[in-house]
């Protein structure tokens, strides 16, 4: 909650609850690594399982720069895109070209964001303006959500509401009181 209201109308993309972010083509230095990161317990009945926790989906990592107005993050941030088909975890490929895709004939399972994290980023701005920092909301993990015929797209907004809990880590202190301040200070990566 809360982040829905904090959607940035400038150039940064902050996914809202329940959205399915795709790496936008215009993102700078957008490197996608296809890694099936989100494993799960193997199902007892691979083709008839009813337990959503036994399903898994892909978490694709990509990097992007955060921009706000004329400012850009000193370093890119890495986040996940929830992608691919949900199926029994043991049948999901571990890498591209390996394993078999499983296509459910029954209910629809959707790969959606599960948890989010907030990360503080240091922004570099033209003209030597005051150092800037902002917090961006990044997808931390994905999950499969079973949809019944009673679900529709809008109802997905209710899912994935667990509060973002950023990892601990000292972040740079943007201390400068003049427009001439050096803003080359970088943020510690999470």
């Amino acid at each position: 909650q809360g982040w829905q209201a904090f959607k940035n109308d400038a150039t940064e993309i902050i996914p809202e609850l329940g959205e399915y972010p795709e790496p936008p083509p215009e993102l700078e230095n957008n490197k996608t690594m296809n890694r099936a990161e989100n494993g799960g317990r193997p199902p007892h009945h691979p083709f008839e399982t009813k337990d959503v926790s036994e399903y898994s989906c892909r978490e694709l990592h990509f990097t992007r720069y955060v921009t706000d107005g004329p400012c850009r993050s000193a370093k890119p941030v890495t986040e996940l895109v929830c992608s691919g088909q949900c199926g029994p975890a043991r049948l999901l490929p571990n890498a591209i070209g390996r394993g078999k895709w499983w296509r459910p004939s029954g209910p629809d399972f959707r790969c959606i964001p599960d948890r989010y994290r907030a990360q503080r980023v240091q922004l570099l701005c033209p003209g030597g303006e005051a150092p800037r920092a902002r917090k961006v909301r990044l997808v931390a993990s994905c999950k499969c959500k079973r949809l019944t015929r009673f679900h529709n797209q809008s109802e997905l907004k209710d899912f994935g509401t667990e509060a973002a809990r950023p990892q601990k880590g000292r972040k740079p202190r943007p201390r400068a009181r003049s427009a001439k301040a050096n803003q080359a200070e970088l943020e510690n990566a999470y």
Epitope: A5, N8, A118, C125, G127, A130, R132, R134, A163, P166
Partner: antibody, heavy 118, light 107 residues
């Protein structure tokens, strides 16, 4: 829904200190910067500073250094502003804000009126 | 400190009119300017940031423009609920500073 609930009005004696609170609901303050702004009828709005509740980083306007101290308690999702050595100049409404950024103020609390009496 | 000057303390308008509220910075602040609306007895609300970006939920009749030292908040098709105080704020350099405010009133 994003909400910032500030503590009630304060009537304090000159020379004393006061601590104002701002409790957030609908979001985690660790995920935002918390700002404080002062408003007086004739002087308008004045920025006091911001705090990053996650690690305690702060930035103060020079005018308020030594006068104001910002703290935050993430366990109670509350930000605090302590004002010391109060004078009539400190009589004002004090607003807390939550922002994604350190530089503009997305959402505001309802304000706390501080009246300093001599 | 950068001084933000709103030369008109009061501006009169009628419902349906278009009104422009101006703000001048004492030095170049690029586009690092925000606008806030404050209705009587309420706390301020963010309308515009980066001089021209509307905040979430702000009606599109509110438009911000300008860069450098001169900034304008334009309200087209003024509604009765727009009668309020409007403040500009610069965040180009510390300390962040606000304009003195412009009160929008009915003629």
């Amino acid at each position: 829904e994003v909400q910032l609930q500030q503590s009630g009005a304060e009537l304090v004696r000159s020379g004393a200190s006061v601590k104002l609170s701002c409790t957030a609901s609908g979001f985690n303050i660790k995920d935002y910067f918390m700002h404080w702004v002062k408003q007086r009828p004739e002087q308008g709005l004045e920025w006091i500073g911001w705090i990053d509740p996650e690690n305690g980083d702060t930035e103060y306007a020079p005018k308020f250094q030594g006068k104001a101290t910002m703290t935050a308690d993430t366990s109670s999702n509350t930000a605090y502003l302590q004002l010391s050595s109060l004078t009539s100049e400190d009589t004002a409404v004090y607003y807390c804000n939550a922002g994604q950024a350190t530089y503009y103020f997305d959402y505001w609390g309802q304000g706390t009126t501080v009246t300093v009496s001599s | 400190d950068i001084v933000m000057t709103q030369s008109h303390k009061f501006m009169s308008t009628s419902v349906g009119d278009r009104v422009s509220i101006t703000c001048k910075a004492s030095q170049d602040v690029g586009t690092a300017v925000a606008w806030y609306q404050q209705k009587p007895g309420q706390s301020p609300k963010l309308l515009i940031y980066w001089a021209s970006t509307r905040h979430t939920g702000v009606p599109d009749r509110f438009t911000g423009s300008g860069s450098g030292t001169d900034f304008t908040l334009t309200i087209s098709n003024v509604q009765s609920e727009d009668l309020a105080d409007y403040f500009c704020q610069q965040y180009s350099s510390y300390p962040y500073t606000f304009g003195g405010g412009t009160k929008l009133e009915l003629k």
